[in-house]
């Protein structure tokens, strides 16, 4: 048996090309230059090669760069990134919007694999924050990106690329990420009109205090139950039955049908049964009259 | 001399799980590919998977999931993990040698092991 | 997804006949198929690889034939000890197909 470890007679690869998909595999190793093949890393996408055959190159490139790629070929990876693990991922130095925009390219209508994430990682810790390009692009690939982050990463997060994010953008949001996103948006739309700055806030009220929902019911919002019913419980609980009804507007009238649910049942609770009965819903479970509420946390705060 | 010994199997009810191992003597596995074939009984060969002397490992579409080809060099050892197994996985498998030194399954598969019986039954 | 398929799947054939086998996938392959040949109770013998080129030891009454998609493995004169199983395998795509190997071609006495 041949030792098949040199390149035959006249099989040395001159240029990355589509002859290349009739090698052998231990072919491709032994005839295909890893430095021809990094210059042309932008040609194998267009030629037809198997999965194992993908291995080998892959393979080629790992031992020219044991350190990892270098982002001029990293750029041009296309469907060899679907073979990288998060370790060689971890080698990268990607700085380049551009060349994360091509990897995310790849990956396009996937869920986000540990690769991607592994890639998004490196590239946000490079820039050393959460710009408003990058998050445009992250959300656009994917809309649940922002929810996937902890509340410490999204502390990174400027106000100015706040405006790069959409409603759909927070559908995943838990209230931790939410109360971290809120002020954030707060002084990112601090310069608009009452209606367009509602329009603009509305998704990240899960994470807004008392006090803001306060002043929004004094500006005519008409706040929809959705989401009113994704409000933080603590913040809703202090309001009254007026500033709830201006802040629901015409809306109000859905609080009957989410009675049994949070936050509407506890907020119910702490309400006094006649200032429920002025809203003619029929809401139950508030304070008999005639019954004393002490507020013990404000006691405690006093002590 | 090329040699090749399959062990491990045996009976196992379904739902179970087994481990195949193939002790290989004569040559270096860092050298070359190895895969697994089986052969339910009265049947053709079918195709289960090979892992390349790189350590890249490639399986029939039927297999993936539920079956795990890795290896060992310095034991000279490779291993079929086989999980959630049904009647239908009862056949002797098959370990058997990249025929080429270049490390891929380029021509064909030689040497072969004598095979090891796994039958799958309550 | 990548199949291949073997015919006939059984034949009957004397001592001295000359037998041919054919196999055909379902998409270019160029040169990378192999044939075996096995016995009942024993592991698959390998014959032939790239098609034409014969496995050390193998008799050279076995030849192979064919690239692309159609192939053939031809015994000039069967003897004795030819009365097997054969089996064609593609080697060119080993990952996510259904199998590699052909459905398989018995030949026994007439």
């Known amino acids: 048996e041949v030792e098949k470890t040199a390149c035959p007679s006249g099989k040395k690869a001159r240029e990355i090309d589509e002859s290349l998909i009739f090698y052998k595999k231990w072919e491709l190793e032994a005839c295909v230059d890893a430095a021809l093949l990094a210059t042309q890393m932008d040609r194998v996408n267009a030629i037809p090669f198997t999965y194992e055959q993908l291995d080998v190159l892959k393979h080629k490139l790992d031992e020219l760069y044991p350190q990892g790629y270098p982002e001029s070929v990293i750029q041009h990876l296309g469907y060899l990134f679907l073979k990288m693990s998060p370790e060689d991922i971890r080698k990268w130095n990607v700085t380049s919007l551009e060349t994360l925009k091509a990897l995310l390219e790849v990956n396009k209508g996937h869920e986000m694999s540990p690769q991607v994430a592994t890639l998004i990682d490196r590239f946000v810790k490079g820039r050393g924050q959460l710009d408003k390009d990058t998050l445009d692009t992250l959300t656009a690939f994917y809309p649940g990106y922002l929810c996937s982050l902890s509340p410490e990463e999204l502390s990174s997060v400027p106000p100015s690329s706040i405006w790069a994010v959409r409603p759909q953008d927070l559908d995943t949001c838990d209230p931790r990420q939410l109360d971290v996103l809120y002020p954030k948006a707060r002084l990112a739309f601090q310069n608009m009109n009452g209606s367009e700055y509602f329009v603009k806030i509305q998704s990240f009220l899960g994470g807004a205090p008392t006090e803001d929902l306060k002043a929004l019911s004094q500006q005519n919002v008409s706040m929809d139950l959705a989401t009113f019913m994704k409000l933080r419980t603590d913040a809703v609980l202090p309001l009254t039955v007026a500033e709830v009804q201006k802040l629901l507007g015409p809306h109000v009238e859905g609080l009957k049908a989410e009675e049994r649910h949070r936050p509407v049942r506890d907020w119910i609770l702490r309400q006094r049964q006649d200032d429920l009965d002025t809203l003619g819903l029929g809401l139950q479970g508030g304070i008999p009259n005639g019954y004393l509420v002490l507020d013990l946390s404000m006691q405690e705060a006093l002590s | 001399q090329s040699q090749l010994v399959e062990s491990g199997g045996g009976l196992v009810q379904p739902g179970g799980s087994l481990r195949l191992s193939c002790a290989v003597s004569g040559f270096s596995l860092s050298s070359y590919a190895m895969g697994w074939v089986r052969q339910a009984p009265g049947k053709g060969l079918e195709y289960i998977g090979y892992i390349s002397k790189i350590g890249t490992t490639y399986y029939a579409s039927w297999a993936k999931g539920r079956f795990t080809i890795s290896k060992d060099n310095s034991k000279n050892t490779v291993y079929l993990q086989m999980n959630s197994l049904r009647a239908e996985d009862t056949a002797v498998y098959f370990c058997?040698?990249?025929?080429?030194?270049?490390?891929?399954?380029?021509?064909?598969?030689?040497?072969w092991g004598q095979g090891t019986l796994v039958t799958v039954s309550s | 997804a990548l199949q291949m398929t073997q015919s006939p799947s059984s034949l009957s054939a004397s001592v001295g006949d000359r037998v041919t086998i054919t196999c055909q996938a379902s998409?270019?392959?160029?040169?990378?198929l192999a044939w075996y040949q096995q016995k009942p109770g024993k592991p698959p013998k390998f014959l032939i690889y790239?098609?034409?080129d014969l496995a050390s030891g193998v008799s050279s009454r076995f030849s192979g034939s064919g690239s692309g998609t159609d192939f053939t493995l031809t015994i000039s004169s069967l003897q004795p000890e030819d009365f097997a199983t054969y089996y064609c395998q593609q080697v060119y795509d080993s990952n996510n197909v259904e199998n590699v190997f052909g459905t398989g071609t018995k030949v026994t006495v007439l």
């Open positions: 790239d098609a034409s």
């Open positions: 058997a040698r990249g025929s080429s030194s270049g490390g891929y399954l380029d021509d064909g598969f030689d040497p």
């Open positions: 998409q270019s392959i160029s040169n990378y």
